[in-house]
């Protein structure tokens, strides 16, 4: 697990505790809350990050219209159960034995039930739509410059392969970033679009997860891009199963 050897820290996740007592005396970093060893050469999974967060002391339109099956994370923070690879377990339960099924980004995709609720598989979120509204600027950003800057950001900061950034739409003041990644497309070692989106979301909120790096300073041709609202929609490979009561 690559971590900065000299001072034993995790560049990609500050919500870790690192010690030089790993195999062979190497620096080993464990995620707060779960204690799972993390690979500091890449992004940490959203599940482990949420668990760490919960354990920490409390502190003609070119725009895409989200599909009827798109999910928004309305439930907020919870202390998730992660599998040994750091992924969300398909079924999540709270301390009062209320359970629900989640997708691969940890967003609820069924009505809540009891301990008898079955979630047969972890359904993959294959399409993420990040909807941003930027603060007023002197003029609109050049679309191609904005597109290039956001693609560079996802490639360099979040290590997401460019092929997974499907599109960047812009209609001032709204920016939409589409991330797409099917199960069959994701190879071993590829950053998950859900993890990249979560790191981006935290960056935008000024809560960077990176160790010691400054916050996100987004500029398009030198002009600061300041986000005032973020909405993220998640589309699953299998549509969610909610009762009609919730949909009305």
């Amino acid at each position: 697990h690559t971590a900065a050897q000299d001072n034993c820290t995790c560049p990609t996740n500050k919500m870790t505790v690192c010690s030089p007592d790993g195999p062979g005396g190497r620096c080993q970093c464990r995620a707060l809350g779960s204690g799972m060893a993390v690979d500091c050469s890449t992004l940490t999974s959203k599940c482990l990050l949420l668990k760490a967060r919960m354990s920490a002391p409390k502190n003609a339109r070119t725009l895409v219209r989200p599909s009827e099956h798109a999910l928004v994370d309305n439930d907020g923070l919870y202390d998730p159960d992660c599998d040994p690879e750091g992924r969300f377990k398909a079924r999540q339960c709270n301390q009062t034995s209320v359970c629900w099924c989640v997708n691969s980004v940890g967003v609820r995709r069924t009505d809540k039930g009891d301990l008898s609720l079955r979630c047969d598989e972890l359904v993959r979120t294959h399409h993420i739509l990040i909807d941003l509204r930027h603060r007023p600027t002197a003029g609109a950003f050049n679309h191609s410059d904005l597109d290039a800057e956001l693609r560079r950001l996802f490639r360099e900061r979040y290590r997401l392969h460019p092929k997974f950034v499907a599109a960047v739409h812009y209609e001032q003041p709204t920016i939409q970033i589409e991330l797409r990644q099917n199960t069959s497309q994701k190879a071993a070692g590829d950053v998950d679009i859900g993890d990249a989106a979560y790191y981006f979301e935290r960056d935008i909120k000024g809560e960077s997860l990176f160790q010691g790096r400054g916050g996100l300073d987004l500029r398009v041709r030198g002009e600061p891009l300041q986000v005032e609202r973020t909405l993220i929609y998640y589309l699953d490979e299998i549509p969610p199963k909610f009762s009609m009561k919730r949909l009305t």
Epitope: V17, S19, D21, P23, G25, Q28, P84
Partner: antibody
Framework: QVQLVQSGAEVKKPGASVKVSCKAS????????INWVRQAPGQGLEWMGN????????NYNQKFKDRVTMTRDTSTSTVYMELSSLRSEDTAVYYC??????????WGQGTLVTVSS | EIVLTQSPATLSLSPGERATLSCRAS??????IHWYQQKPGQAPRLLIE???ESISGIPARFSGSGSGTDFTLTISSLEPEDFAVYYC?????????FGGGTKVEIK
């Protein structure tokens, strides 16, 4: 060589607290986690939690979370484990153990804590 | 938490025989398993780490194998001093947990 030396046996009354010390030597104290493991008479091993002396980060087994406190004193290379609201079931040998990588390679000699009225 | 189940609870063998001890994890833990030997009145002693990696000073007759959920500690030829209780422990995630132990006794 690495040594973990624990404080002596204790007899306590139910409801009282006990504080066991573990003094480390022979290695860089701040570089290795110190764990606390207990063993009731005739029973198996039970992990209570750990502390990373470099920054005092602690992690407790949920079972003991409300009753256990682990602290460290870097000036004396000593770690402390305090268990409060003692009950008879807490009668056990308490070990401190340090790990090189993930296995507990180094163990203290154990401290017998007897809880009896 | 990850539950470790050791079997058998007791193993009755004679010196010179081969001992095979099993440890099963409730979920995949890769190779984050470690084996200990404990004799009466003594602290446990680390024998094997990361499922199969030997520890200096531990006799070569002790070996470990397995990954995922099933792990084995093998003592190729039992010596009189090997009769003791053996524990497996996982370090995949907190809380770290131990198996219930296997007692290797003289037949």
């Amino acid at each position: 060589q690495v040594q973990l030396v624990q404080s002596g046996a204790e007899v306590k009354k139910p409801g009282a607290s006990v504080k066991v010390s573990c003094k480390a030597s022979g290695y860089t104290f701040t570089s290795y986690w110190i764990n606390w493991v207990r063993q009731a008479p005739g029973q198996g091993l039970e992990w209570m939690g750990n502390i990373y002396p470099s920054n005092s980060y602690t992690n407790y087994n949920q079972k003991f979370k409300d009753r256990v406190t682990m602290t460290r004193d870097t000036s004396t290379s000593t770690v402390y484990m305090e268990l409060s609201s003692l009950r008879s079931e807490d009668t056990a040998v308490y070990y401190c153990a340090s790990y090189r990588s993930d296995g507990f390679a180094y163990w203290g000699q154990g401290t017998l804590v007897t809880v009896s009225s | 938490e990850i539950v470790l189940t050791q079997s058998p609870a007791t193993l009755s063998l004679s010196p010179g025989e081969r001992a095979t001890l099993s440890c099963r994890a409730s979920q995949n833990i890769g190779t984050s398993i470690h084996w200990y030997q404990q004799k009466p009145g003594q602290a446990p002693r680390l024998l094997i780490e990361f499922a199969s990696e030997s520890i200096s000073g531990i006799p070569a007759r002790f070996s470990g194998s397995g990954s995922g959920t099933d792990f084995t500690l093998t003592i190729s030829s039992l010596e009189p001093e090997d009769f003791a209780v053996y524990y497996c422990q996982q370090s995949n995630s907190w809380p770290f947990t131990f198996g219930g132990g296997t007692k290797v006794e003289i037949k």
